[in-house]
């Protein structure tokens, strides 16, 4: 079974700082903002059958996903 | 579904500014990056620059001296200004947003040709 | 800023062969354990469209011919099996840090 792809919660370098949760990493600014002020993939209501953007994101292909992580995104840690 | 739509001049006289806006419907540009982008006549992407969720803006130092981009959220709207323009600024302009966390520009307007010439 | 060179510049294939193109950075683009590398496809008068992000992972819509590899420098776009709407002009680009750069693109032509 595919894992989607991990969040900017990398293991292998240091996390120049934690977020809190409802925060996440922006990678340009380089520190912790609200989620929501990031254009994150927002969860479709149950039921929903309207197609997707042409080139929106999907979880599908792992990007190195360690067991367990869930699919982008993922606040906290960077 | 995010939907981005150029809109301004076709024709811009040399030394003039360009002005385009892009409208965004299906989020709101206090979400995210919002990016302008642009492709000269048979030729690759050139990336101008940004604005952000909070209004701050970052433009690619070859176009710096010359490009303001700035926004108006009751509108949903953002807009790029390109001064002194010359012919070399005759190219395809997009604006494009990416997704967060690998920021990769997934939605895109269709595009606008913005010719100099007098 | 971070230069991405695309080879080959054109490849001539015919439907149901096998596409590689190349995309090499000056400098890595991994960051976080993420590869911050994307591919576009697009075709004339068309916007770009985004086919492949953070190195390997589909765009929603996307066929499972297109798929994406590599890491650090180097990286591959593959399309397994050419259909005829698949020749298009094909760009990477690095989202690792702005200025987000391109490549200048590998044309996928009919032999």
């Known amino acids: 079974m595919r894992r989607g792809p991990r969040s900017l919660r990398g293991r292998d370098a240091p996390a120049p700082t934690p977020c809190v949760p409802a925060e996440c990493f922006d990678l340009l600014v380089r520190h912790c903002v609200a989620c929501g002020l990031l254009r994150t993939p927002r969860p479709k209501p149950a039921g929903a059958s309207s197609p997707a953007p042409r080139t929106a994101l999907q979880p599908q292909e792992s990007v190195g996903a360690g067991a367990g992580e869930a699919a982008l995104p993922l606040p906290g840690l960077l | 579904e995010v939907q981005l739509q150029e809109s301004g001049p076709g024709l811009v006289k040399p030394s003039q500014t360009l002005s385009l806006t892009c409208t965004v419907s299906g989020d709101s540009i206090t979400s995210g990056y919002w990016n302008w982008i642009r492709q000269h006549p048979g030729k690759g992407l050139e990336y101008i620059g940004y604005?952000?969720?909070?209004?701050?803006?970052y433009y690619n130092p070859s176009l710096k001296s010359r490009v303001t981009i700035s926004r108006d959220t009751s509108k949903n709207q953002y807009s790029l200004k390109l001064s002194s323009v010359t012919a070399a600024d005759t190219a395809v302009y997009y604006c494009a947003s990416p997704n967060y966390p690998f920021y990769a520009m997934d939605y895109w307007g269709q595009g606008t040709l913005v010719t100099v010439s007098s | 800023d971070i230069v991405l060179t695309q080879s080959p510049a054109t490849l001539s294939l015919s439907p149901g062969e096998r596409a590689t193109l190349s995309c090499r950075a000056s400098e890595s683009v991994d960051n976080y354990g993420i590869s911050f590398m994307n591919w576009f496809q697009q075709k004339p008068g068309q916007a770009p469209r985004l086919l492949i992000y953070?190195?390997?992972n589909r765009a929603t819509g996307i066929p499972a011919r297109f798929s994406g590899s590599g890491s650090g420098t180097d990286f591959t776009l593959t399309i397994s099996s050419l259909e005829p709407e698949d020749f298009a002009v094909y760009y990477c680009?690095?989202?690792?840090?702005?200025?987000?750069?391109f490549g200048g693109g590998t044309k996928v032509e009919i032999k």
């Open positions: 604005i952000s969720y909070s209004g701050s803006t």
């Open positions: 680009q690095q989202s690792k840090e702005v200025p987000w750069t």
């Open positions: 953070a190195a390997s």
